[in-house]
């Protein structure tokens, strides 16, 4: 007697008769910009503060008539599914409402714009709590839009956006596309990505997660108790809005960055059917329906890392792609990946005092992506050493050198535009795991951390004959912070985490020949920090 | 996600401050650039959003808006100031015709200007 | 089948508070499909709602009498109550208890009062 | 709030005569309207709910139509155990029942 969405992001132990997480959320304000609202909804009535904040085009058609009940159908139902008495994830959170969208669900980039200036304004009026913004709107990409979502997330508030009804690349829509908001894609009662009519869930890498987004009962204007099923990824949105106001209202404290870190990390785990997306979005979309933390406590003590991956370089011959982490993380590893395999690797450089990732593209080459591993690492001191093409038969390499230093990731760049096609691969000398081993005609970049208690180790896996994918894994309570392929494989297309899985990439193997030069092996960095374990245990 | 340079259509006008005789003229080798939605239907041309350097105060903003109001009408053009952003982004909501962009792309404190373009439920 | 039977004094004095119970049977009163319902009716007068709770105790009441009622519940005693304060002779009625289908799982039933108690007459007298 | 006005408030029949009774929303409550019988001494009991759905166990002979602002209960022909008060009651915002009508033999 539960509907499916809220038991799908109900973790097992929560389980035993009906939706029982505690009345979560009830520190946080959600502020919903969308219609205007039914507030005396017996699902909202009570909990939904009705702003005065109204900023919205008149209706198109000469004969549009405005029924209330249809104007206020969208946010009802939203506001719903995020804190709804009944059918709501967050049932304790209070929401405040400003009107944005029309009564046909229309509105602008400049309306939209006021209200977050809005919202701005209010929080510096009256700090409360954390603050969480719903936006379930998406228009074309917009660089004012995605600037003051910026804005406002470096100012605290943790902004959740629909990734779109498109069927499309979610970058190419905002705030979806704003990379400080958390964009959230639409999945069914089969975990399969949502088909709305001829069109559908966005996805791509500007996609942070998917969560439920069809057939998702809410609050239904149409009268004061009534329910009606919707879906979208206003929908979804609206679930990741909830999610997050039960954890802030659990760990008041928690960072933007945080908080993103711990929804990837709870949701659930390649149950996706990736088939659906587009061949050449299915690597950059992640894998994730979101899901509420098995306890409200607890989740600090381990090391959190996410994957984020550039915007594609594009296929001339010097381009190159950069992808970045957010403020609050450390880019703890770098690596690239080309559909062709054409490329001249990567490096971690200084851009405005951070550390980015950089993927070099090859002549001839249709472009790279850039792919960094971000992680949250509390006083961590990070450094890249880099060691230029080595003359030496042995290859190049290079080690973590300063005390107390561990080896988090490894990269190499090389200028020349076929590495290693008639050259044999190099092989690691054995005991030696906390240094890159690389091509002797590549730089190989170190990535070196210092921070309280982080250990790690390297893990491989080869796999002697030719084949499209060679993926290793860190085992249970380490975390992947690098990724990479051991040099001397010509055909690899490139290398880059999946959770907690190192994932190398081949050329089709039908094309590639079963010589020396198919051995693939997969390296993977795991860390953990005892630091973060004990401080946990501590708090406990 | 989107980097600001992303994948969507940007007009730059790379335009020389000769006209006015501007008193705070662009810094040089600065230009201002501007932006529309890439969705032609999504467009509100009329509407456009004046985003001003990050570190220019409300009053600053103001005084930009008009000066473009002023010369604008110089030019036989009316305008609106419909909005004065401040506290997330410094800058103006301006309703003014298209051949004003240029004029309005030569102000001080002026990054970029954006045409106001539909958002939509989902 | 569910059946719901009101308890509770027949008098209280004017000013004071008026307290009644509703015990349910041949069902749960912890399932989120159901809301359960307090409904009076004056002699010889219409029917008014007073107010509704879910197993989750959480509330919502008839905006004219908000500020006087409070609706309870004891999953546990599968019982659920209605305190009135400040009672004058208006609020003289025969009080009902009430199921009301929540409206989530519609495979519930419809969303109305069903079934109802056999009520209870309270008079508010001196 | 919205006022429910039902009419006539008695109306004398017969048994195996045709009842119809009527009631009027202060504003559009759409379909969200239901009807229900009540007896001497009893408590109130669902007839019809959604305008037009009959609960369960409900005889065939009553039926209700309506939506918007007018609505109306119809029992083809009188039972003799169906002379009692009517009243609709609406859910489009909150709940308020009508004033009742009685049905009563002629």
């Known amino acids: 007697s539960i509907p499916w969405n809220l038991e799908r992001i109900t973790p097992p132990r929560y389980r035993a008769d009906e939706y029982q997480p505690p009345d979560g959320g009830s520190l946080v304000e959600v502020y919903l910009l969308d219609t205007s609202i039914q507030s005396d909804h017996r699902e909202i009535e009570g909990r939904v503060m009705v702003t005065d904040f109204e900023n919205v085009p008149e209706e198109d058609g000469t004969r549009f008539h405005r029924q209330a009940s249809k104007c206020d159908s969208h946010g009802t139902h939203l506001a719903g599914v995020v804190s709804g008495r009944d059918a709501g994830v967050a049932k304790g959170a209070s929401m405040r409402s400003l009107r944005v969208l029309n009564c046909q669900g229309k509105g602008t980039v400049s309306g939209t714009l006021i209200g977050l200036e809005f919202i701005r304004k209010s929080q510096l009026v009256q700090p409360v709590g954390p603050l969480v913004v719903l936006l379930p709107l998406a228009g074309g990409y917009s660089r004012v839009l995605n600037a003051a979502c910026q804005r406002l997330a470096r100012a605290g508030v943790v902004l959740v956006t629909a990734a779109g009804n498109f069927r499309d690349d979610a970058c190419l829509y905002s705030p979806a596309s704003a990379p400080e908001v958390i964009t959230v894609g639409a999945t069914n009662a089969q975990d399969q990505p949502v088909t709305l009519g001829t069109l559908g869930t966005n996805f791509g890498r500007c996609v942070d997660l998917f969560a439920p987004g069809e057939d998702i009962i809410g609050a239904s204007s149409d009268c004061s108790t009534c329910f009606v099923s919707q879906s979208g990824t206003s929908q979804a949105a609206a679930h990741v809005a909830g999610i997050a106001a039960m954890m802030l209202s659990a760990e008041p404290e928690l960072t933007l960055a945080e908080l993103r870190q711990r929804l990837i990390h709870f949701s659930a785990k390649d149950v996706i059917n990736e088939a659906w997306f587009p061949e050449d979005q299915r690597v950059l979309t992640p894998n994730l329906v979101a899901a509420l933390p098995p306890s409200t406590h607890g989740a600090g003590w381990q090391l959190f890392c996410r994957t984020v991956w550039s915007a594609h370089s594009g296929p001339t011959r010097m381009a190159t792609a950069v992808a970045r982490c957010a403020p609050d993380e450390e880019l703890l590893s770098c690596s690239s990946f080309s559909r062709s395999g054409k490329r001249r690797g990567e490096r971690m450089e200084a851009q405005g005092g951070k550390l980015v990732c950089r993927a070099h593209n090859a002549f001839g080459g249709e472009g790279v992506y850039a792919i960094a591993r971000c992680c949250l690492l509390p006083q961590a001191n990070c450094s890249v050493h880099t060691a230029p093409p080595a003359e030496a038969s042995m290859g190049t390499r290079v080690h973590c050198h300063q005390q107390g230093h561990v080896l988090t990731g490894c990269s190499s760049h090389w200028e020349v535009e076929d590495l290693g096609t008639h050259k044999p691969p190099v092989l690691r000398p054995r005991g030696q795991p906390n240094q890159c081993v690389g091509h002797r005609e590549a730089s190989i970049h170190a990535s070196c951390c210092h921070a309280p208690g982080l250990e790690c180790k390297v893990k491989e896996h080869g796999i002697p004959a030719p084949q499209e994918q060679v993926t290793v894994a860190c085992e249970e309570g380490w975390t992947l912070t690098g990724c990479s392929a051991l040099p001397g494989t010509s055909h690899v297309l490139g290398a880059y985490a999946v959770d907690n899985t190192c994932v190398v990439r081949s050329r089709d193997v039908s094309t590639t020949g079963s010589t020396s030069e198919g051995a693939v092996t997969a390296v993977a960095i795991c860390c953990r920090s005892r630091h973060l374990a004990q401080a946990s245990q501590e708090l406990q | 996600q989107e980097d600001e340079d992303g994948d969507y259509e940007e007009l730059v006008l790379a335009l020389r401050s000769e006209e006015d005789g501007l008193a705070e003229a662009p810094e040089h080798g600065t230009t201002a650039t501007f932006h529309r939605c890439a969705k032609d239907p999504w467009r509100l041309p009329g509407t456009y959003v004046v985003v001003l350097k990050e570190e220019t105060h409300l009053s600053q903003s103001e005084r930009t808006a008009r000066r473009l109001q002023a010369q604008a009408a110089r030019r036989g053009y009316l305008t609106k100031i419909l909005h004065v952003f401040h506290g997330l982004l410094p800058g103006f909501l301006v309703k003014m015709s298209g051949d004003l962009l240029e004029l309005a792309l030569k102000l001080p404190h002026v990054d970029y200007i954006e045409e106001d373009s539909s958002v939509f439920a989902q | 089948q569910l059946q719901l039977q009101e308890s509770g004094p027949g008098l209280v004095k004017p000013s004071e508070t008026l307290s009644l119970t509703c015990t349910v049977s041949?069902?749960?009163?912890?399932?989120?499909?159901?809301?359960w319902a307090w409904i009076r009716q004056p002699p010889g007068k219409g029917l008014e709602w007073i107010g509704s709770?879910?197993?989750?105790?959480?509330?919502y009441y008839n905006p004219s009498l908000k500020s006087r009622v409070t609706i309870s519940v004891d999953t546990s005693k599968n019982q659920f109550s209605l305190k009135l304060s400040s009672v004058t002779a208006a609020d003289t009625a025969v009080y009902y208890c009430?199921?009301?289908?929540?409206?989530?799982?519609?495979?519930?039933?419809?969303?109305?009062?069903?079934?109802w108690g056999q009520g209870t007459l309270v008079t508010v007298s001196s | 709030e919205i006022v429910l006005t039902q009419s006539p408030a008695t109306l004398s029949l017969s048994p195996g005569e045709r009842a119809t009774l009527s009631c009027r929303a202060s504003?559009?409550?759409?379909?969200?309207l239901a009807w229900y019988q009540q007896k001497p001494g009893q408590a109130p009991r669902l007839l019809i709910y959604?305008?037009?759905n009959r609960a369960t166990g409900i005889p065939a002979r009553f039926s209700g139509s309506g939506s918007g602002t007018d609505f109306t209960l119809t029992i083809s022909s009188l039972e003799p155990e169906d002379f009692a008060v009517y009243y609709c009651?609406?859910?489009?915002?909150?709940?308020?029942f009508g004033g009742g009508t009685k049905v009563e033999i002629k």
């Open positions: 009430a199921r009301e289908n929540s409206g989530v799982v519609p495979a519930a039933g419809p969303n109305w009062f069903d079934p």
């Open positions: 041949g069902g749960s009163i912890g399932s989120s499909s159901y809301y």
């Open positions: 709770i879910n197993y989750r105790g959480s509330t």
């Open positions: 504003q559009s409550v759409s379909s969200y």
């Open positions: 959604d305008a037009s």
């Open positions: 009651q609406q859910r489009r915002n909150w709940f308020t």
